[in-house]
């Protein structure tokens, strides 16, 4: 998630939007102005061509992997489970984000030559990818919780409801990403290449922080708590009942959630620390500011990498994904039908035991 950084932060930020031009210098000056040591912003120094190569690799892997995932799910119309629909949307979100990577890569070399419209759009897609991802995973956790803990399918098996939930997730993701759409723009300067970044203008610090705290809490913390609750009870039920088959069915989902958390939790924790520092819950110092900037750079790459990882999980852990892919290849005559496993069907869904299905 961006970079959800309300970053056009002049020292007015520290003064909660007061006009420093009227500040009385007869009173005690703020310590950062008295400190002879300069506070020079720092971030990780990484060769721009290395960044371009990373973007290119993630783009290619994500494009190929997520396209295949969508293809396999769309081919398996008959046995498609609710979780498959959520995973289809997850792949779509990753794919949309991956399509913006060549633009980010080009901007790394030439500066932002694409104007404000594309600046807003590609930034929005990055945010939407993150929010839709975590919200979809939260929905999967609720679906698995209802199916395994409460042994109910009545809610989630209604196709129109699932479609409505997915549309709501996309809508909510757009809403949560709205600050980026509002404040991101191309900034031109005589000294540097054009840049696409968050320019908050003269908005007060309170307004700035509200726009950061709301998406962070509703878009990350709340879904995270839902997942912890649902998967906690789901795991407990599986272990108590010794449901081996169902436990195996959950492997892919757990792997997807784990990878998501490993990729996005570090970045969001740093972002949370940044927010706490800006709201002066944690005292801001030059050293802390720079530590956070370096940490944002170090952890953001994990979030970018995430967009190409889910297909790899399905390929290595999801037996049904492999079978479904082989089936499609066989249908199109790309491989021999004899090489297909006996139980292979063009579906992500395996055997349905009780009220749950072995997804992927």
């Amino acid at each position: 998630m961006e970079d959800f950084n309300m970053e056009s932060d002049s020292f007015e930020d520290f003064w909660k939007g007061e006009d420093l031009s009227n500040y009385s210098y007869s009173s005690t000056l703020p310590p950062f102005l008295l400190d002879a040591a300069p506070c020079e912003p720092e971030s990780l120094e990484i060769n721009k061509y290395f960044v371009v190569i990373i973007y290119a690799l993630v783009f290619l892997l994500s494009l190929l992997g997520n396209s295949l995932v969508m293809l396999v799910i769309l081919y398996s119309r008959v046995g498609r489970s609710v979780t498959d629909v959520y995973l289809l949307n997850l792949a779509l979100a990753d794919l949309l984000f991956a399509l913006t990577l060549p633009i980010w890569a080009a901007s790394k070399v030439n500066g932002w030559i694409f104007g404000t419209f594309l600046c807003k759009v590609v930034s929005l897609l990055k945010e939407v990818n993150f929010y839709s991802g975590i919200l979809l995973l939260a929905c999967i956790s609720v679906d698995r919780y209802l199916a395994i803990v409460h042994a109910t399918r009545t809610l989630t098996q209604k196709r129109y409801l699932v479609k409505f939930i997915c549309l709501s997730i996309w809508g909510l993701s757009l809403l949560l990403a709205l600050p980026v759409l509002l404040f991101r723009r191309t900034v031109y300067s005589s000294n540097v290449s054009p840049a696409c970044y968050e320019d908050m203008g003269n908005n007060t610090a309170n307004w700035r922080m509200l726009l950061r705290i709301l998406p962070q809490s509703f878009g990350f913390i709340v879904p995270l708590l839902i997942m912890l609750f649902c998967y906690g009870f789901t795991l407990r039920t599986l272990f108590k009942a010794h449901m081996g088959q169902k436990h195996r069915a959950m492997r892919v989902i757990f792997a997807v959630v784990l990878i998501f958390l490993l990729c996005w939790l570090p970045y969001n924790l740093v972002l949370l620390a940044d927010t706490l520092m800006r709201t002066q819950v944690i005292q801001e110092t030059c050293e802390r500011r720079n530590h956070i900037d370096r940490a944002l750079d170090a952890t953001e790459i994990l979030g970018i990498l995430h967009s190409c990882l889910n297909p790899l999980i399905y390929a290595f852990i999801g037996q049904k994904f492999r079978h479904g892919l082989l089936k499609i290849l066989a249908i199109h005559g790309l491989i021999s039908k004899d090489s297909l496993p006996k139980d292979s069907r063009p579906s992500f869904v395996g055997s349905s035991s009780g009220h749950t299905s072995t997804t992927l």
């Epitope: 961006e2 056009s8 420093l20 912003p41 000294n191 030059c286």
Partner: nanobody
């Protein structure tokens, strides 16, 4: 890398004039406030005058009516015209600027830094 370079300091007689210049260079997105500070041996650095990007100016009482701060935004330069200099104006004069720069490897973020020049000596003596 942002740098502030001062010039114009030197030895002057009481009642004389000097014009200090400070130019900011490097990957600068925007300069918010530029100012002049001074420091005498054993004392804390004090603000002399500063000017915002919008043209708002502040002076300390000791220099009002004698010193004039101005800036050229197109050249990222701030000037301090010092007239009717007094021996108590003797100090090392430092240029300070609140500069917005871009940081970030993957996504660019604007950050405001507090930058200082290396200082220029002003000596008022007969």
């Amino acid at each position: 890398e942002v740098q502030l370079v001062e010039s114009g300091g030197g030895l002057v007689q009481p009642g004389g004039s000097l014009r200090l210049s400070c130019v900011a260079s490097g990957s600068i997105v925007r300069i918010n406030t530029m100012g002049w500070y001074r420091q005498t041996p054993g004392k804390q650095r004090e603000l002399v005058a500063d000017i915002t990007s919008g043209g708002n100016i502040n002076y300390i009482d000791a220099v009002k009516g004698r010193f004039t701060i101005s800036r050229d935004n197109t050249k990222n330069t701030v000037y301090l015209q010092m007239n009717s200099l007094k021996p108590e104006d003797t100090a090392v004069y430092y240029c300070n600027a609140e500069i917005v720069v871009l940081v970030g490897v993957w996504t660019q973020r604007a950050r405001t830094g507090n930058y200082w020049g290396q200082g220029t000596q002003v000596t008022v003596s007969s």
